[in-house]
Amino acid sequence: MKRKERIARRLEGIETDTQPILLQSCTGLVTHRLLEEDTPRYMRATDPASPHIGRSNEEEETSDSSLEKQTRSKQCTETSGIHADSPYSSGIMDTQSLESKAERIARYKAERRRQLAEKYGLTLDPEADSETPSRYSRSRKDPEAAEKRGVRSERSAESSRDAGSSYSRTELSG
């Protein structure tokens, strides 16, 4: 049996189980790509508070992240216009696909920073803290980074959590 057919059959078998994981529209895939050199440290790298996603300690400990990765990879290549039949799916990349990967990573990181700014008040640049010493000089940074990041989003204690968060939107009094 051809490798492609084998993978397709394996994916068919798990697609129904892993469907909710795909709702995050490829951010998971980007994260896995971002972190491939780092051993995956979680049972499932998805938000545990979401129903059917994540694995609590009442469930089985075995990890099926490699299957998830395949499913997510398939879904994401399709949604990004790269079809399973195309040479890109075999790992052959041209400049265009490398650029789109870089864009996805940039989008993922921007979203991560946005959420962290809202939840914890993480500033989006070092200049926001006037006391930051010169070790983080402008020359060390990407000159376009400020433009890519947009305006600084300082979170006040009363601000609500982002709508995508599965944590409750309880206002903070502390």
């Epitope: 050199e37 070092p126 409750s168 309880t170």
Partner: antibody
């Protein structure tokens, strides 16, 4: 293997400043925020703040604003914390620690810790 | 700031016992609570995050539960190496805060 390696113990005079370093290895330094945590017998574990190594963006515990300054150097995968105007209250073990990561949602708990640096402030 | 209160500073146990450590948040933190174990002379080690999710490599005798303001960390069968200090931490909002710790010791 993911590792954080901090600088050695420091004995410093009151009023002086000290800079602690934390070198990361085994993962992409810019993909995770780096945090600093203080531990004393009296106050237990206290979160000082965090830095995004890629942008230099920071978040501080208000209690430590002005006391601690966090920076990072991407080229050497090293995070730094400068402690200013030291008093005996600043004598503690200081840990650098990496935040855990999620796809889709991001929460700050700490999955990798170093062994810590002991800072003693004494005249 | 959110205060995390661990009501027991010390808990006595025997090897093989089941033990539960509690932690109470001063306000609703949903399920944003992590648990750490710290042995003497070592750094804390992550055991549980998001209230009930066991960190990779952590034995299944460790479990966590709770939401809102009340959280419980349970060791189903205490081993000698479990004698340590256990801390809860809220990761709901800044500043991140820890409980004062519960020291697990032998009876």
């Amino acid at each position: 293997q993911v590792q954080l390696q901090q600088s050695g113990a420091e004995l410093v005079r009151p009023g002086a400043s000290v800079t602690l370093s934390c070198k990361a290895s085994g993962y992409t330094f810019t993909d995770y925020e780096m945090h600093w945590v203080k531990q004393t017998p009296v106050h237990g574990l206290e979160w000082i703040g965090a830095i995004d190594p890629e942008t230099g963006g920071t978040a501080y515990n208000q209690k430590f604003k002005g006391k601690a300054i966090l920076t990072a150097d991407k080229s050497s995968s090293t995070a730094y914390m400068e402690l200013r105007s030291l008093t005996s209250e600043d004598s503690a073990v200081y840990y650098c620690t990496r935040s855990g990561i999620y796809d889709g949602n991001y929460w700050w708990y700490f999955d990798v810790w170093d062994t810590g640096t002991t800072v003693t402030v004494s005249s | 700031d959110i205060v995390m209160t661990q009501s027991h500073k010390f808990m006595s146990t025997s090897v093989g016992d089941r033990v539960s450590i509690t932690c109470k948040a001063s306000q609703d933190v949903s399920t944003a609570v992590a648990w750490y174990r710290q042995k003497p002379g070592q750094s804390p080690k992550l055991l549980i995050y998001s209230a009930s999710y066991r960190y990779t490599g952590v034995p299944d005798r460790f479990t966590g539960s709770g939401s809102g303001t009340d959280f419980t960390f349970t060791i189903s069968s205490v081993q000698a190496e479990d004698l340590a200090v256990y801390y809860c931490q809220q990761h709901y909002s800044a500043p991140l805060t820890f409980g004062a710790g519960t020291k697990l010791e032998l009876k």
